[in-house]
């Protein structure tokens, strides 16, 4: 039930995938991650105007109630719809190990 | 990977389940739903301070990057972690029918 992908606020202003470059220090990972030393973090950023990429019925309800009661009910929020896995080389007591994280990098976005 | 449930902002200020009473008119459903005439909409509302109910690794990253770049990266957002199904009696071309919606009422909440 994913609604319109046309952003009424102008190009790039609505909920979409962004890439933010971050070091291990930025992420607070320097003490337990060996590699990569820098991560291209993909995340969901942007506004969720009426019915834009509405994830489900709940998002549609939220839009309606936000319009009626903006001080009580927040607008839908731009969050990951799915994720891309990422591999980290981690420090361990005995050396290093490879670990795959399924919930680290956003793959695409919707409003909920 | 759901982190702390202690809200540092004070009781009830952080991400949690709220109930908002809404009529069919409020929801824009009056033309296609017969019953219920009023819905107790459960939704997720509240702030997501550092590591509060962090849904996953992505939420933890978002918290770290929001602290570093608050103008670029938004704080995690309070959204449903799961849903309760709800039944609507809908108007159809031939009369009425029962329809179960799995994604209408939030059951519990997390930050993402």
């Amino acid at each position: 039930a994913r609604n319109g992908d046309h952003c009424p606020l102008g190009p790039g202003r609505c909920c979409r995938l962004h890439t933010v470059r971050a070091s291990l220090e930025d992420l607070g990972w320097a003490d337990w991650v060996l590699s990569p030393r820098e991560v291209q973090v993909t995340m969901c950023i942007g506004a969720c105007p009426s019915q834009f990429r509405a994830a489900n019925m709940h998002a549609q309800i939220k839009t309606s109630l936000h319009r009626l009661k903006p001080d009580t009910v927040p607008a839908p929020c731009c969050v990951p719809a799915s994720y891309n896995p990422m591999v980290l080389i981690q420090k361990t007591d005995t050396g290093v190990s490879l670990q795959t994280y399924d919930d680290l990098l956003a793959k695409d976005c919707h409003c909920i | 990977a759901r982190n702390g449930d202690h809200c540092p902002l004070g009781p009830g200020r952080c991400c949690r389940l709220h109930t908002v009473r809404a009529s069919l008119e409020d929801l824009g459903w009056a033309d296609w739903v017969l019953s219920p005439r009023e819905v107790q909409v459960t939704m997720c509302i509240g702030a997501c301070p550092s590591q509060f109910r962090a849904a996953n690794m992505h939420a933890q990253i978002k918290t770290s990057l929001h602290r570093l770049k608050p103008d670029t990266v938004p704080a995690p957002c309070c959204v449903p972690a799961s849903y309760n199904p709800m039944v609507l009696i809908q108007k159809t071309d031939t009369g009425v029918s029962l329809q179960t919606y799995d994604d209408l009422l939030a059951k519990d909440c997390h930050c993402i």
Epitope: - | L34, S35, V39, Q40, P85, V87, L98
Partner: nanobody, 122 residues
């Protein structure tokens, strides 16, 4: 405390019939909307039919319309679901639930009892 007990399930061949019963104890059924729900393995609950408390109106999901009939017997404090022309996709655990006083249907799918297993297979 509102307690509902379902019975009448079983194994039946495609095209066959069953009648499920939902018996109440601790309260009078005719004051409440009663709904039948089902849950197939690995799927969410689905409302199948309900009967309103106010005027006895009956409602059905599109998947069972014309095949299932809901009725109530106030003297026996029981609601029935007559299931005809059963199909393999009707296989599920069937539950009944009571809605709020004065409602047309139990709206929120909440907690329920043990249910009764219906299996349609040749």
């Amino acid at each position: 405390q509102l307690q509902l007990v379902e019975s009448g399930g079983g194994l039946v061949q495609p095209g066959g019939s069953l009648r499920l019963s939902c018996a109440a104890s601790g309260f009078t059924l005719d004051y409440y909307a009663i709904g039948w729900f089902r849950q197939a393995p690995g799927k969410g609950p689905e409302a199948v039919s309900c009967i309103s408390s106010s005027d006895g109106s009956t409602y059905y999901s599109d998947s069972v319309k014309g095949r299932f009939t809901i009725s109530r017997d106030n003297a026996k404090n029981t609601v029935y679901l007559q299931m005809n022309s059963l199909k393999p996709e009707d296989t599920a655990v069937y539950y009944c639930a009571a809605g709020e006083y004065g409602s047309d249907c139990p709206v929120q799918v909440g907690s329920w009892g043990q249910g009764t297993q219906v299996t349609v297979s040749s």
